[in-house]
């Protein structure tokens, strides 16, 4: 492996080299670990309610988007997947499964259909969808 | 891979880790860890040579696709990114940075442009591209 010094001088790049390597997790086996959160993408299509139960059965929740910085891997996600965001008709707000309110400017909410559930799509977009429609889904487990 | 028990004693944490949960890595800080491989997606566009050097400077290589099963997270990647696959004009084969030959049926190679480098695109597709064209890139580090 060429030294970073030599490479930097060669290409005149200012590449910052991480000083440390670290372990990520713990996560369920074969889940994606990123910034100590665990993610899994499920291929089988389920409605929102079954997707929620499936995540719960794996000691997780449907995806919660809480930070563009900590979750920047989500920018590159292809397709549409159920996340844990639901519309509360009584007060018109969007909230996560834990009851916390969707922070402003985190997601661009797009009305694709009439519905009370939301699909995550790349670049931090949320598509409103009927909760009964089957879709793939993303489960997430936050490590302590 | 260090056992959860050892990690807990090392960091003096009193965390009970379910048997089905495990740590992933080690990886450079803030990289994605999946099935004990480390990945990072770089936003800045560089040509293939600069992308290769950037990965090397971080003790990594451009993405090597070696298993659809172990790297199934790549199915969901949006957009096009340089990977470590190059065309060898002398024998017409495609090979990785480490000199290994591209295994059959791993990638669908699509000729987008005349070129000797390849962009990774979702669902295990490889797009042939001129190595001098700037693109985003994926670095990968395999843990031992």
């Amino acid at each position: 492996i060429w030294s970073a010094v030599f490479l930097n001088s060669l290409f005149n790049q200012e590449v910052q080299i991480p000083l440390t390597e670290s372990y990520c997790g713990p996560c369920p086996k074969n889940w994606i670990c990123y910034k100590n959160n665990c993610y899994q993408f499920f291929n089988e299509s389920k409605n929102w309610y079954e997707s929620q139960a499936s995540c719960m059965s794996q000691n997780a929740s449907l995806l919660k988007v809480y930070s563009k910085e900590d979750q920047d891997l989500l920018k590159l996600v292809k397709s549409y997947h159920w996340m844990g965001l639901v519309h509360i008709p009584t007060n018109g707000s969007w909230q996560w499964e834990d009851g916390s309110i969707l922070s402003p400017n985190l997601l661009t909410i797009i009305e694709m259909q009439k519905g009370d559930c939301a699909l995550y799509a790349s670049s931090f977009k949320g598509y409103i969808e009927n909760c009964s429609i089957p879709n793939t889904y993303i489960c997430m487990q936050r490590t302590v | 891979i260090w056992s959860a028990v050892f990690l807990n004693s090392l960091f003096n944490q009193e965390v009970q880790i379910p048997l089905t949960e495990s740590y992933c890595g080690p990886c450079p800080k803030n990289w994605i860890c999946y099935k004990n491989n480390c990945y990072q997606f770089f936003n800045e566009s560089k040509n293939w040579y600069e992308s290769q050097a950037s990965c090397m400077s971080q003790n990594a290589s451009l993405l090597k696709v070696y298993s659809k099963e172990d790297q199934d997270l790549l199915k969901l990647v949006k957009s096009y990114h340089w990977m470590g696959l190059v065309h060898i004009p002398t024998n017409g084969s495609w090979q990785w940075e480490d000199g290994s030959i591209l295994s059959p049926n791993l990638l669908t190679i699509i000729e987008m442009q005349k070129g000797d480098c390849a962009l990774y695109a979702s669902s295990f597709k490889g797009y042939i591209e001129n190595c001098s064209i700037p693109n985003t890139y994926i670095c990968m580090q395999r843990t031992v």
């Epitope: 309610y49 139960a53 719960m56 000691n59 834990d98 009851g99 | -």
Partner: antibody, heavy 121, light 107 residues
Framework: QVQLLESGPGLVKPAETLSLTCTVS??????????WDWIRQPPGKGLEWIGS???????YYDSSLKTRVTISVDTSKYQFSLRLSSVTAADTAVYYC?????????????WGQGTLVTVSS | EIVMTQSPDFQSVTPKEKVTITCRAS??????LHWYQQKPDQSPKLLIK???QSISGVPSRFSGSGFGTDFTLTINSLEAEDAAAYYC?????????FGPGTKVEIK
């Protein structure tokens, strides 16, 4: 108005299998947002969740009972059932069936009247 | 599993008094906490869902609050018909668990 009614034997011998059925009336068992549950309450004690089922047949069980419990659904009969094998006196309880209306994290909004099952020889 | 604790175990209260029952979860459960009332020889009845959401048909004297690990059920002006056991229930993760209950008696 949805109503739930438990039925099954009130007395079961030790080591045998307890079988109960819950019949749903006044509503659909296949509504996409509904989950159906079994909960029990030993005499003079608190409530214990046994498990949930969705109309598709997906089940979710309490880990301490997992090896002994089976919950199934028969959508054509508007029924879901509980089977608990190898019972002991500790399984003596009032058994309730209940519903979550809007997904599995929702509260139990409708309960059956409960049926007392005694485990004794 | 998430362990739910309730206090007090027992409360003897005079009519029109305010009653406060607390429920604590062993880890954060967001607002996935529900309250039930159970009268002798009856099945439980839902009072409050998602920590603070009122239920149609439940008298307005019943209210709930809290988020995370600490929750409260308040009966604003106790009536004789409120003599019952009160249970909290977490639906945040499997297995679902209930608090041990608080018995409210009318003096």
């Amino acid at each position: 108005q949805v109503q739930l009614l438990e039925s099954g034997p009130g007395l079961v011998k030790p080591a045998e299998t307890l079988s109960l059925t819950c019949t749903v009336s006044g509503g659909s068992i296949t509504s996409t947002s509904y989950f159906w549950d079994w909960i029990r309450q030993p005499p003079g004690k608190g409530l214990e969740w046994i498990g949930s089922i969705y109309h598709s047949g997906s089940t979710y069980y309490d880990s301490s009972l997992k090896t002994r419990v089976t919950i199934s659904v028969d959508t054509s009969k508007y029924q879901f059932s509980l089977r608990l094998s190898s019972v002991t006196a500790a399984d003596t309880a009032v058994y309730y069936c209940a519903r979550h209306e809007f997904g599995i994290r929702d509260a139990f909004d409708i309960w059956g009247q409960g049926t007392l099952v005694t485990v004794s020889s | 599993e998430i362990v739910m604790t309730q206090s007090p175990d027992f409360q003897s209260v005079t009519p029109k008094e305010k009653v406060t029952i607390t429920c604590r979860a062993s880890q954060s459960i967001g607002n996935n906490l529900h309250w039930y009332q159970q009268k002798p020889d009856q099945s439980p009845k839902l009072l409050i869902k998602y920590a603070s959401q009122s239920i149609s048909g439940v008298p307005s004297r019943f209210s709930g609050s809290g988020f995370g690990t600490d929750f409260t059920l308040t009966i604003n002006s106790l009536e004789a018909e409120d003599a019952a056991a009160y249970y909290c229930h977490q639906s945040n993760s499997f297995p679902f668990t209930f608090g041990p209950g608080t018995k409210v008696e009318i003096k």
